[in-house]
């Protein structure tokens, strides 16, 4: 999905009002300082293309975090602010469907969680040079 | 503007009815909706939502019972309520989850009432 | 699912700050939403995501959410602010919405 015509100022606001915090509680316990952020974004669209695939691909060592309330909050805010997106998606969760995994914390999830807090942070601030 | 209609009626304990809400004035199939019921004199109760791409979720006292569908095409949340219990009696409100987590927008409210 | 406690009724004298309280286990980790419904009348989204306003809704409503307790403030209570009260946040294990009993406000 391309999602440059995404309504980013919305997203920004859903991350802000009813995303963020959740982020947060997932990670409550861990020390900010325990992961390196190694995933980063240049832009608004290429930030919500890697925030997309690290919140619903599973990944070695964490299978589960699209079915963390973050997960579900992020998809329902893509489908409203991004054209088209609800549509392109339909087909993938059919697939996802016949794979669902239980929840589980492990520490690699709380890494990708982690940079997760990063690519958010990088999107709302588009105006910062890259470092 | 955006609106929710839904239609409701009258059933006997053990039996089924169907609740539909038609949406109209924004992108309905975007959108995550849900129902919600108020039993008379009582507070509000969530009771099941749905995704625009079928997730569902279920109030652990109607699973099994009752399930959620959308027809995307028609603009239309449905609920299907079998195995009706006189608790189930309520006003059912269909109603609009932004973001997952919270309602922006409500029907009127559409009474059920599960009598013999 | 989690459980959201809220005072069955709460009076205040026009003019005057009312305070609303509902009461979670580790409720400040969760976003809270409050609802007002009139008789009659389906609800209304007053607070989101703990403190901001819906554009509608008046100055006088705010929110706060810390610890075990979140807070709906009227401040300066008006004769139509008579009406019941729902907080509203969600259950992270089951991803369901959880609703708290509901407040009525008397504006004596």
């Known amino acids: 999905y391309d999602f440059t015509n995404c309504d980013f100022e919305k997203i920004k606001a859903a991350y802000l009002s009813t995303i963020s915090k959740d982020l947060i509680t997932y990670m409550s316990g861990t020390k900010s300082t325990e992961f390196n952020n190694t995933v980063s974004c240049s832009n608004r669209p290429h930030c919500l293309t890697e925030i997309q695939s690290l919140t619903f691909n599973p990944t070695a060592g964490c299978a589960s975090l699209a079915k963390e309330m973050f997960a579900m909050k992020t998809k329902a805010a893509l489908a409203i602010w991004c054209p088209g997106y609800s549509e392109t998606q339909i087909n993938a969760t059919q697939a996802m469907k016949k794979r669902r995994k239980r929840k589980v914390t492990t520490n690699k999830c709380l890494e990708q969680v982690s940079q997760l807090q990063g690519l958010w942070r990088r999107f709302n601030r588009p105006l910062l040079k890259q470092q | 503007q955006v609106q929710l209609v839904e239609s409701g009626g009258l059933v006997q304990p053990g039996g089924s009815l169907r609740l539909s809400c038609a949406a109209s004035?924004?992108?309905?199939?975007?959108?995550?909706m849900s129902w919600v019921r108020q039993a008379p004199g009582k507070g509000l109760e969530w009771v099941s939502g749905?995704?625009?791409?079928?997730?569902?979720y279920y109030a652990d006292s109607v699973k099994g019972r009752f399930t959620i569908s959308r027809d995307n095409s028609k603009n239309t949340l449905y609920l299907q309520m079998n195995s009706l219990r006189a608790e189930d009696t309520a006003v059912y409100y269909c109603?609009?989850?932004?973001?997952?987590?919270?309602?922006?927008?409500w029907g009127q409210g559409t009474l059920v009432t599960v009598s013999s | 699912d989690i459980e959201l406690t809220q005072p069955p009724s709460v009076s205040v004298a026009p003019g005057q700050t009312a305070r609303i309280s509902c009461g979670g286990d580790?409720?400040?980790?969760?976003?809270v939403y409050w609802y007002q419904q009139k008789p009659g009348q389906a609800p209304v989204l007053v607070i989101y995501?703990?403190?901001k306003r819906p554009s509608g809704i008046p100055e006088r409503f705010s929110g706060s959410n810390s610890g075990n307790t979140a807070t709906l403030t009227i401040s300066g209570t008006q004769a139509e602010d008579e009406a019941d009260y729902y907080c509203?946040?969600?259950?992270?294990?089951?991803?369901?919405?959880?609703f708290g009993g509901g407040t009525k406000l008397t504006v004596l």
């Open positions: 109603a609009r989850q932004q973001y997952f987590d919270h309602i922006d927008i």
């Open positions: 004035g924004f992108t309905f199939s975007s959108y995550y």
């Open positions: 509203q946040s969600y259950d992270l294990k089951s991803l369901n919405v959880v």
């Open positions: 995501g703990d403190s």
């Open positions: 749905i995704f625009f791409d079928g997730t569902t």
């Open positions: 580790s409720l400040g980790g969760k976003y």
